[in-house]
């Protein structure tokens, strides 16, 4: 099995223009030529044999290595005998230098020749003589050379005429490989060998189409620098959908599946299910019937649940408790549970709108698991219809109409609203005046407001209540020098408003009679 | 750019002697060889040698012995073609012509404008 | 000393037609043979050396094939800017042009 070959320059398969650097820029010349077989090829020419001490440098444009730790220069030329040029047998030469200079980018176009590296001289086999210019072949010299190891990202080569004839028909720039092949199910890619002749270079193999790699049993072999794979280790295994056969992985056919790697041949479709194409993982579900995220590809498919049945309801002034039985058909699947849905509908034309995010719902408005829930802050004398849905893990995979059970009702009397604008008036050392505004929506007569009030730093563990018919009241019988919480709510006949977010104050210290301000430290809403 | 400029129409009388002076400009003019031709009126071009510009070293083709020598000034970068004993026959254009030496043949690649030398009593 | 014979003398052709002209050494050359244009009044013009090698400049309409002692040149679709005279030139011990072609005006 061959080395392969990887170009990093061919001047040969250039049409444009090469453009590389000539140092003076009457040196090396740029022009159209023929090679031996008469194709169109781009070559460097130079001929200043008649002045003495030549030194042409041409520069060819930045060579990126790639992965290449040792590079190949092949070179093409013709050399001109110098005895067939009149004059100039002091002054002609018949070998020329050849030069690298390692970098990590392109350098720009100066060429600093102290940087450059002599890899040899080049003296042509066969040069030609005037007779020999008939020949269009004109007596093609080939020289290969070896530069490297190279630690840099990339390299110039650069061509030294000390003033021979010589025109450049080709340069080739490469580095070996290991042909890519295929061993139990990996491919081992061409693989760049080493930088030493004697280097083993390690080479993880890559899954062929539609397989991958065995538990901690990772495909590898050696690369040897001569471009020969050694003894391979691992191996990679058929995907989901596929099975082996020979060197590559088949897909499953039609009406069968393989879910898994690891099995090691393809199944039928379970039921409600099927594959109409080849190379299936995970067969569909017939129309209705749906998969969800979290099945595994081996159960039935399954459908959503049948409507709730048996739906009755409660009403408490603006609390509606409600109350189903399990569906008739549960699609197949055992993760039911139920979702309300709650409209508000008007009294004219019976069009109906969400009800919006200030309803509250115990336990929970969605994923019930419980076949009851009690709705709670309606307002009060309106109407509403509830629908109580039935859902399971395929639900929000149908796009067939939802089934549920509904039922309409119109609320009674409510709650007061929450107070609000509670202000302090006075602060002393064992008392506090408060005042406050009535609710924004009484919802009836409001027959008297409770004050609720502890410690801070009890928490809550412990509390007094006060109450009072008026919009003010005065707290007595409290420590000094204590920071208390107070909270405000309205009672009317229908029930207790929500109490009024936690105002902070606190009462004067023992030791001082004077007055003063007290701050609110912290305020938020606290449910009833 | 490389440009050969020649010096303008001379007319001679027979036994006379011209010198025509060719500058070089644009490149290095010890480089190139320096190539004359000679073109009578209505004739073809007729190659009268080459002198190499390094060493000064002239070459001369058959029947331009004798009467025709080339010389350089190359602190002028300046070739000249001195033609001595004129004689009615040698009325024509000369040129002097920058020698192209490459690897796949010559050639003359730059040409001064040709000065037109009369000999006539 | 090496004699080249340019054939023919003169060539009518109209704008746009192929142009061949003919040059025969009488002993080998190899392919050391120059072509040159001169139009009247001007000083020659290199086309074409080491016997099909186009410096810069020269439109690729010119071409030239030949080796030792038949050399052609061919101007594919002739332009009203080469009507002219070509003549070749051989680079041996001495060096000697063809007598010439004048491609004219058809």
């Known amino acids: 099995q061959a080395a392969k070959e990887v170009l990093l320059l061919d001047s040969k398969a250039q049409q444009t223009e090469l453009e590389w650097i000539s140092s003076p820029p009457s040196g090396w010349e740029e022009i159209s030529g023929l090679d031996e077989n008469y194709t169109p090829i781009r070559t460097y020419q130079v001929c200043q044999v008649m002045e003495p001490n030549q030194n042409n440098w041409l520069r060819t444009n930045w060579i990126s290595k790639g992965n290449a730790q040792r590079i190949f220069v092949e070179l093409k030329f013709t050399l001109r005998d110098c005895n067939s040029l009149p004059g100039v047998l002091g002054t002609c030469k018949e070998t020329f230098n050849l030069y690298y200079y390692e970098t990590d980018y392109d350098t720009g176009r100066n060429i600093r020749e102290n940087l450059y590296v002599k890899i040899d001289t080049i003296a042509a086999d066969e040069s030609f003589t005037q007779g020999d210019l008939g020949e269009r072949k004109m007596k093609l010299n080939t020289e290969v050379r070896e530069i490297g190891p190279l630690s840099k990202k990339g390299f110039y080569l650069a061509f030294q005429d000390v003033g021979a004839c010589i025109a450049l028909v080709s340069v080739k720039v490469y580095y070996k490989k290991c042909w890519s092949i295929v061993e139990n199910l990996a491919v081992f890619p061409d693989t760049v060998t080493g930088s030493e002749f004697s280097s083993l270079v390690e080479v993880r193999g890559t899954c062929v189409s539609s397989a991958e790699e065995e538990a901690e049993n990772s495909p590898r072999m050696h690369c040897s620098a001569e471009g020969e794979w050694l003894v391979p280790i691992g191996k990679c295994i058929c995907k989901a959908g596929y099975q082996q056969k020979g060197d590559t992985c088949e897909p499953c056919g039609r009406r069968f599946y393989k879910s898994s790697s690891q099995d090691l041949q393809c199944s039928r479709c379970p039921t409600h299910s099927f594959s109409d194409r080849e190379g299936s993982s995970r067969c569909e579900c017939e129309d209705g019937y749906y998969r969800a995220p979290s099945d595994p590809p081996y159960v039935a498919c399954t459908r959503p649940p049948s409507a709730p049945q048996n739906l009755i309801f409660n009403i408490n002034q603006t609390t509606v408790s409600l109350e189903w039985s399990p569906p008739a058909d549960n699609g197949g699947r055992n993760d039911v549970t139920y979702r309300i849905l709650c409209k508000r509908c008007s009294w004219e034309q019976g069009e109906c709108v969400p009800c919006g995010s200030n309803i509250g719902y115990m336990p929970q408005q969605t994923g019930l698991e419980d076949n009851y829930v009690t709705v709670m802050d309606l307002l009060a004398h309106a109407n509403y219809t509830f629908e109580v849905e039935a859902v399971n893990g395929v639900s929000d995979l149908s796009r067939s109409q939802r089934l549920f059970a509904a039922v309409s009702i119109t609320t009674g009397q409510a709650a007061p609203s929450q107070v609000s604008g509670v202000m302090k008036e006075r602060v002393l050392q064992r008392s506090v005046q408060l005042s406050w505004q009535e609710p924004e929506h009484p919802n009836g007569v409001i027959t008297e407001y409770e004050i609720k009030y502890y410690e801070k730093d009890q928490r809550e563990r412990t509390y007094s209540t006060l109450k009072t018919k008026s919009t003010s009241a005065s707290i007595n019988n409290l420590k000094p020098g204590t920071v208390y919480v107070f909270q405000i709510r309205a009672v009317t006949a229908a029930g207790y408003g929500n109490y009024s977010p936690r105002l902070d104050v606190a009462t004067l210290e023992e030791a001082s009679g004077k007055m003063f301000e007290a701050t609110a430290v912290s305020s938020e809403q606290n449910p009833v | 750019q490389v440009q050969l400029l020649q010096s303008g129409a001379e007319v001679k009388k027979p036994g006379a002697s011209v010198k025509v002076p060719c500058k070089a400009s644009?490149?290095?003019?010890?480089?190139?060889?320096m190539s004359w031709v000679r073109q009578a009126p209505g004739q073809g071009l007729e190659w009268m040698g080459w002198i190499n510009t390094n060493t000064g070293n002239p070459t001369y083709a058959q029947g331009f012995t004798g009467r025709f020598v080339f010389s350089l000034d190359t602190s002028v970068s300046t070739a000249y073609l001195q033609i001595s004993s004129l004689k009615a026959e040698d009325t024509a254009v000369y040129y002097c012509?920058?020698?192209?030496?490459?690897?796949?043949?010559?050639?003359?690649?730059?040409w001064g404008q040709g000065t037109l030398v009369t000999v006539s009593s | 000393e090496i004699v080249l014979t340019q054939s023919p003398a003169t060539l009518s052709v109209s704008p746009g037609e192929r142009a061949t002209l003919s040059c025969r050494a009488s002993?080998?050359?190899?392919?050391?043979l120059p072509w040159y244009q001169q139009k009247p009044g001007q000083a020659p013009r290199l086309l074409i050396y080491?016997?099909?090698t186009r410096p810069t400049g020269i439109p690729d309409r010119f071409s030239a094939s030949g080796s030792g002692t038949d050399f052609t040149l061919t101007i594919s679709r002739v332009e009203p800017e080469d009507f002219a005279v070509y003549y070749c030139?051989?680079?041996?011990?001495?060096?000697?042009f063809g007598q010439g072609t004048k491609v004219e005006i058809k």
């Open positions: 644009g490149y290095t003019f010890t480089s190139r060889a």
């Open positions: 012509a920058r020698v192209r030496f490459t690897v796949y043949g010559d050639g003359m690649d730059v």
């Open positions: 080491g016997a099909s």
């Open positions: 030139q051989q680079y041996g011990p001495s060096w000697t």
């Open positions: 002993q080998s050359v190899s392919s050391n």
